[in-house]
Interface confidence: low
């Protein structure tokens, strides 16, 4: 099959993949005259990744809670085995109800976008369901997601979140819209509203145009035992145990204290659906108790007390003192003071001595007081806050904060790579990738003080040196290392950082980055010596920036061959002499030649080797660069990119051409092609200019 | 893993009580409702009722009600299912079941109450 | 109550083909207020307790194969296993979760030929 160039520049030809992983296809080139020797193009087929979601990928969530996923709900893998922190998941559509945020990040900032699989395994990836105003009984969210881990291709999965009062709920012992109990004054009595005890969301459990005809019964089980409940005026008895729901609404249940102390009371009772004309269906049911306080009426409100945050290390455990909790109550014993935990943070929990290893929830003030009670922190280091309900089991419950912050228990620098300083400059910025540093997370408050500084040169901010400076400094890019001393190719200097009250040292390296044109090219012929020019190594752009003539020592290499000085002439005396040192001037003049060896002790083929120079130039520090290059055996059909100024002895014998190169003159005209074959016009004439040069 | 871990075998008089034991582990005992669901020998399954381990609130099948108390011990995670006024009727495998909503994801082993004069 | 009705009572199926399973209730286990049935299939094997296969009439619990798959709304619903393996050998119950008493079929009992 014949394919032209402009066929291979337009996309037109395609390879098709079938059976083995490697491969590929012969071909021959022609111009309409002349036409090349065979080729081979190799292709290699890469096996294709695969990523599968497991997991149910349903998620059921308490009202107004936070939930984790877990890998119970959502777990991807790929084929390839990729690391969880590789496939990631794409937060296509967030969700309606609520709300998917990171654990470890600030809980009130924006919607999450992406996560980890990784992020899901640590519990880390959570749902909060925002209450909505409307009752309901059963509410459904969905989230779309893409898994993605380059190279396979993305897969869209979906996450169905079932949100339902059903549940069993630490954090909502009640299946109503509302059990928040009644305060009476003693002796006096209370209407009980929608506002304390509110069972809509059962009714919500009924499809909206039968909803009308449908209402929640209440069935008293156990009546108050220092009161009495009344509907419509009429008191509640064994005879006439229920009232309803639309009765509550209209503001119909009243709650009589009898008098006689201020002691706790309540009633248990069972709500149900009731269908058309008192009908009993099919539904939702909850049986509860309703918490009725008595207060006294001459009694003072506790006064809560400011509040200062509880600091410890994470992985650590603190007790809580009146620091923390503390409120003003001449009318109530320590032990009366109880505090109830509403929301907790993540990065720990509440414990009492005494009572288990698990959180705790509620506690009084003599918890407090005594030292019993302590915070663990056993998430991750940051600041979270306690939001608690107190009350003196008469008044009315006030709410509280605690503040805790987490400090790292260390932090790490991150040094990811050495400053590099261009060497006609001198200077240069630092940045993250110089100094960064991470406890359990990013710090991005840290501060840096110079507890050894350069030899070489100064640490600046804003032109002026400086021996402390911050991490936003850093990443504005404001801190800047100066060399003040021309002598030196790298310099260090040792730094200690501070972050959230913990200190970690580190060594910044400095190395200076050479203003050298480096070209090695392709492979060069084994035995032969070629020139090294400026199209090899070029320094003249430092040479103008500096204004002088820059200067090249030899540090190292060539492990197999030698930097030689070439005669001018071949009437020039002697033959080449072995190099030290060098300026760009001989570069310019072509005076110099590298003698390319063979590698010793092994079999003839392909060899790496390399140059390591140290750099000079006026006013500049030094810098060392290297030039790495590829060798072959000598092919006399291959062009060469660099100009070869002999050739091995026996390729000259071979090819009956004594003539063609000499060892000490300029290159005859099969050994050179001193111009780089550069493909212009795509693929074919990349292949033509090597193939017909 | 989740477990649901039932006391063993009875064999109980007409008349007579029964008391079975259902231990959780691997999971928030708190967190997840407790069913109770019956097999009399060579037949379908029957449900008798919920327990909610966080409040202790109940939910039992008209056909038990009087009969049957569910109760919960969660310094230990453990349920109970105590059947009273037993009839020969009532012999069967009885399983406790943990769910979130209503269909049930683990299931306990089954204990068997023979009831037998 | 809600009374759920299985069909056949017992079906004997070769080894790879389909099995199907029929599930009727009483009324419907629909709730339209999030278009979501609320029927679950089980299998039970003898000396076994029942074992979660499909919840909400089609998803599937984690870990049961995808052979087995639960379709149907309203009142009528199946459960469909495909490329029939020995294991499946066992009998399978409805169940629907939408009210209390939650109610299960009397039970199908699937024979591998």
């Known amino acids: 099959r014949t394919r032209s160039g402009s066929q291979l520049d337009g996309g037109l030809v395609l390879f098709s993949h079938r059976g083995t992983l490697d491969g590929g296809f012969r071909f021959r080139l022609s111009d309409g005259e002349h036409t090349s020797p065979g080729h081979f193009f190799r292709v290699t087929a890469q096996k294709q990744v695969l990523l599968s979601l497991k997991g149910s990928q349903t998620l059921t969530v308490c009202p107004g809670s936070v939930q984790p996923l877990s890998s119970q709900t959502l777990r991807a893998s790929s084929s390839a085995g990729t690391d969880p922190q590789l496939l990631l998941y794409r937060v296509v559509r967030g969700p309606q109800l609520g709300r998917l945020f990171h654990a470890q990040q600030d809980s009130t900032g924006e919607a999450l976008v992406n996560f980890t699989q990784a992020e899901v395994y640590a519990g880390n990836i959570l749902y909060e369901h925002e209450m909505p105003p409307e009752p309901f009984w059963e509410a459904h969210d969905t989230l779309e997601l893409q898994l993605s881990s380059p190279p396979a291709r993305d897969v869209a999965a979906t996450l169905a979140v079932a949100v339902s009062f059903e549940a069993a709920c630490p954090q909502r012992p009640s299946h109503l819209w509302k059990n928040k109990g009644l305060w009476v004054p003693e002796g006096q009595r209370a209407r009980i509203t929608v506002a304390a005890l509110d069972a809509s969301n059962l009714l919500a459990s009924v499809p909206s145009p039968q909803r009308s005809e449908h209402d929640v019964l209440f069935q008293v089980t156990q009546f108050p035992s220092r009161g009495q409940l009344l509907v419509s005026e009429e008191p509640l008895h064994a005879g006439q145990p229920h009232f309803l729901q639309s009765q509550l609404a209209a503001g119909q249940l009243v709650y009589a204290h009898g008098g006689g102390g201020t002691q706790q009371d309540g009633f248990h009772f069972r709500a149900h659906l009731q269908g058309p004309a008192g009908a009993s269906v099919a539904g939702p049911q909850t049986s509860e108790a309703f918490a009725i306080t008595v207060r006294d009426v001459n009694e003072r409100p506790p006064q809560p007390q400011a509040s200062v945050p509880l600091r410890l290390t994470r992985g650590s455990r603190a007790p809580i003192s009146r620091a923390q909790l503390s409120v003003v109550d001449p009318d109530s014993a320590p032990g009366e003071i109880e505090y109830e935990v509403q929301r907790a943070p993540h990065n720990g929990f509440l414990s009492l001595v005494g009572g288990g290893l698990g959180p705790v929830t509620r506690f009084t003030q003599a918890d407090v007081d005594s030292g019993r009670l302590a915070f663990v922190a056993n998430g991750s280091s940051v600041a979270g806050i306690f939001q608690l309900s107190m009350s003196d089991g008469a008044s009315p419950p006030l709410p509280m904060s605690l503040a805790v912050d987490i400090l790292p228990s260390a932090i790490e620098v991150q040094l990811r790579a050495p400053l590099e300083v261009p060497q006609a400059l001198g200077r240069s910025s630092l940045s993250q990738q110089q100094l960064r540093v991470v406890s359990d997370r990013e710090e991005p408050e840290a501060a840096y003080r110079l507890i050894q500084g350069p030899q070489y040169g100064h640490l600046l901010v804003g032109g002026r040196p400086t021996s402390a400076f911050s991490q936003f400094q850093i990443d504005q890019g404001e801190v800047v290392f100066a060399f003040t001393n021309s002598s030196s190719s790298h310099d260090h200097f040792r730094v200690l950082a501070l972050a959230r009250g913990v200190n970690a040292s580190a060594v910044v390296n400095v190395t200076v980055r050479a203003l050298l044109h480096v070209w090695a090219g392709g492979p060069w012929p084994q035995g032969a010596t070629l020139r090294l020019d400026p199209t090899v190594l070029d320094a003249g752009e430092l040479a103008n920036r500096t204004d002088s003539v820059p200067r090249f020592r030899l540090l190292e290499g060539p492990r197999h061959g030698r930097v030689v000085r070439v005669p001018r002439a071949r009437t020039e005396p002697g033959g080449s002499q072995l190099v030290e040192q060098f300026t760009q001037q001989d570069l310019e003049d072509g005076r110099l030649g590298l003698e390319v060896g063979r590698p010793e002790g092994r079999a003839p083929g392909p060899a790496g080797d390399s140059l390591t120079l140290e750099l000079w130039a006026q006013g500049v520090p030094p810098a060392v660069a290297s030039l790495d290059f590829a060798t072959e055996p000598y092919n006399a059909a291959r062009p060469y990119s660099v100009a070869l100024l002999s050739v091995p002895e026996a390729a000259r014998t071979e090819a009956g051409k004594p003539e063609s190169s000499t060892p000490t003159g300029e290159p005859g005209p099969m050994a050179s092609s001193p111009e780089p074959a550069v493909a212009k016009g795509g693929f074919l004439s990349f292949l033509e200019a090597n193939m017909f040069s | 893993q989740v477990q649901l871990v039932q006391s063993g075998a009875e064999v109980k008089r007409p008349g007579a009580s029964m008391k079975v034991s259902c231990k959780a582990s691997g999971y928030t005992f708190t967190n997840y409702y407790i069913h109770w669901v019956r097999q009399a020998p060579g037949q379908g399954l029957e449900w008798m009722g919920w327990?909610?381990?966080?409040?202790?609130?109940?939910n039992y099948a008209q056909k038990f009600q009087g009969r049957v108390t569910m109760t919960r011990d969660t310094s230990t995670s453990t349920v109970y299912m105590e059947l009273s006024s037993l009839r020969s009727e009532d012999t069967a495998v009885y399983y406790c079941?943990?769910?979130?909503?209503?269909?049930?994801?683990?299931w306990g082993q089954g204990t068997l109450v023979t009831v037998s004069s | 109550d809600i009374v759920m009705t299985q069909s056949p009572d017992s079906l004997a199926v070769s080894l790879g083909d389909r099995a199907t399973i029929n599930c009727k209730s009483s009324q419907s286990v629909l709730n339209s207020k999030n278009n979501r049935n609320y029927l679950a299939w089980y299998q039970q094997k003898p000396g076994q307790p029942p074992k979660l296969l499909i919840y909400?009439?089609?998803t599937r619990e984690s870990g049961v194969p995808d052979r087995f798959s639960g379709s149907g709304s309203g009142t009528d619903f199946t459960l469909t296993i495909d490329s029939l393996q020995p294991e499946d050998s066992a009998t399978y119950y409805c169940?629907?979760?939408?009210?209390?008493?939650?109610?299960f079929g009397q039970g199908t009992r699937l024979e591998i030929k």
């Open positions: 909400w009439a089609s």
């Open positions: 169940q629907q979760h939408y009210s209390t008493p939650f109610t």
């Open positions: 327990i909610n381990p966080n409040s202790g609130a109940t």
């Open positions: 079941a943990k769910s979130w909503v209503s269909w049930f994801a683990s």
